[in-house]
Interface confidence: low
Amino acid sequence: MGNSCYNIVATLLLVLNFERTRSLQDPCSNCPAGTFCDNNRNQICSPCPPNSFSSAGGQRTCDICRQCKGVFRTRKECSSTSNAECDCTPGFHCLGAGCSMCEQDCKQGQELTKKGCKDCCFGTFNDQKRGICRPWTNCSLDGKSVLVNGTKERDVVCGPSPADLSPGASSVTPPAPAREPGHSPQIISFFLALTSTALLFLLFFLTLRFSVVKRGRKKLLYIFKQPFMRPVQTTQEEDGCSCRFPEEEEGGCEL
């Protein structure tokens, strides 16, 4: 016990001695944040001048405060120990690390181009004030039907197909990732769905018979409680179309 106590004291003395030696060698290391080591005044710690800061100790100069001018506005004032932080004036949003740029907001249903805000083309949407127009989800690619039509501001809402009408299934599914438009004929899709539903029900009742016989009533209730759904991704693809499809004939776009 005494030995370990001695070790601690010795270590502390070593550290303190090292710090003292270091400060004797480099008096600037004593200068705290908010000050700088002034070489013109025998390395005295001088406070940072107005509109400058030092966020760490031992600095030989203070950094100039960032000025939030023009389209930038001050989110946090500069202090002697930390830089100012800017955001953008209303109607603009930040871009880049530390809000290095301000980009113009557009309305929902629009995207920003070099010539300003432009409406999303037919078949695309933007539900934010920033970013680009993205294609509507193609429900048929997931075997679903369109429950609610898309607009310039909103994606389509995919509704159930006959195959989704099994017990416990959710009736409206979030859109899957946006994909290129498909052209599968609706009638073929419908009959395929109908056939697969019939087969599913057949398999389902066969399974039930064996379940009742083998595992009893508890297991049967458990099967009924499970929704027959596969996981659906809800993330949208980041980039989508811009108003530049030669085949588009809808109004409101600059082609």
């Epitope: 023009g70 930038f72 871009l95 530390g98 290095s100 980039d239 811009s242 530049r244």
Partner: antibody, heavy 120, light 107 residues
């Protein structure tokens, strides 16, 4: 009319550094980004990095990170590109270019180019 | 990084020809694409931005189309002044990258 005027040709030894300037006139210097793009003899264009002069935020391509420093002097409307530890493969024409829409954008105005030759 | 591949590398054509240059991106870049013209010893010149918007002062015989990964620059009727090298550039994501260039030469 926006103009970007670059400094003259340079001949450098391997291992040394070069600093190229790009002076802008005829526009609000602070409100757009200045990028540096290089072109080796008979080769294509390669983006090196850029700066937003309004407060000096620079952005570099990974390939040049640690070897290139891009700065801007608002008082003289001049951007600078310094490339260190030069090697023979850095022999190229270095262009400054302006983009006004966003940081990553098309370049609507270009400097005339500065030829940097690295040779022992 | 997003790779930009131009084809063809060299194109021989005559004055009055309709010329098409293709640029393919290794991943979708929406419409964030520009086309430049460069003549020997000169800086590149912006022709098209946002895939299809014509830069002011550029003749209307130049046009751009495409979205996603496939883009095209078309010169409807090639003029003597159009013999040059053409580059595409994506500015969808960091770092912005250029195609290797297409040289349009006299047949």
């Amino acid at each position: 009319q926006v103009q970007l005027v670059q400094s003259g040709a340079e001949v450098k030894k391997p291992g040394s550094s070069v600093k190229v300037s790009c002076k802008a006139s005829g526009g609000t210097f602070s409100s757009y980004a200045i990028s540096w793009v290089r072109q080796a003899p008979g080769q294509g264009l390669e983006w090196m990095g850029g700066i937003i002069p309004i407060f000096g935020t620079a952005n570099y391509a990974q390939k040049f990170q640690g070897r290139v420093t891009i700065t801007a002097d608002k008082s003289t409307s001049t951007a600078y590109m310094e490339l260190s530890s030069l090697r023979s493969e850095d022999t190229a024409v270095y262009y400054c270019a302006r983009s006004e829409f966003r940081f990553y954008a098309d370049f609507d105005y270009w400097g005339q180019g500065t030829t940097v030759t690295v040779s022992s | 990084d997003i790779q930009m591949t131009q084809s063809p590398s060299t194109l021989s054509a005559s004055v009055g020809d309709r010329v098409t240059i293709t640029c393919r991106a290794s991943q979708s870049i929406s419409s964030w694409l520009a086309w430049y013209q460069q003549k020997p010893g000169k800086a590149p010149k912006l022709l098209i931005y946002d895939a299809s918007s014509l830069e002011s002062g550029v003749p209307s015989r130049f046009s751009g189309s495409g979205s996603g990964t496939e883009f095209t620059l078309t010169i409807s009727s090639l003029q003597p002044d159009d013999f040059a090298t053409y580059y595409c550039q994506q500015y969808h994501s960091y770092p912005q990258t250029f195609g290797q260039g297409t040289k349009v030469e006299i047949k």
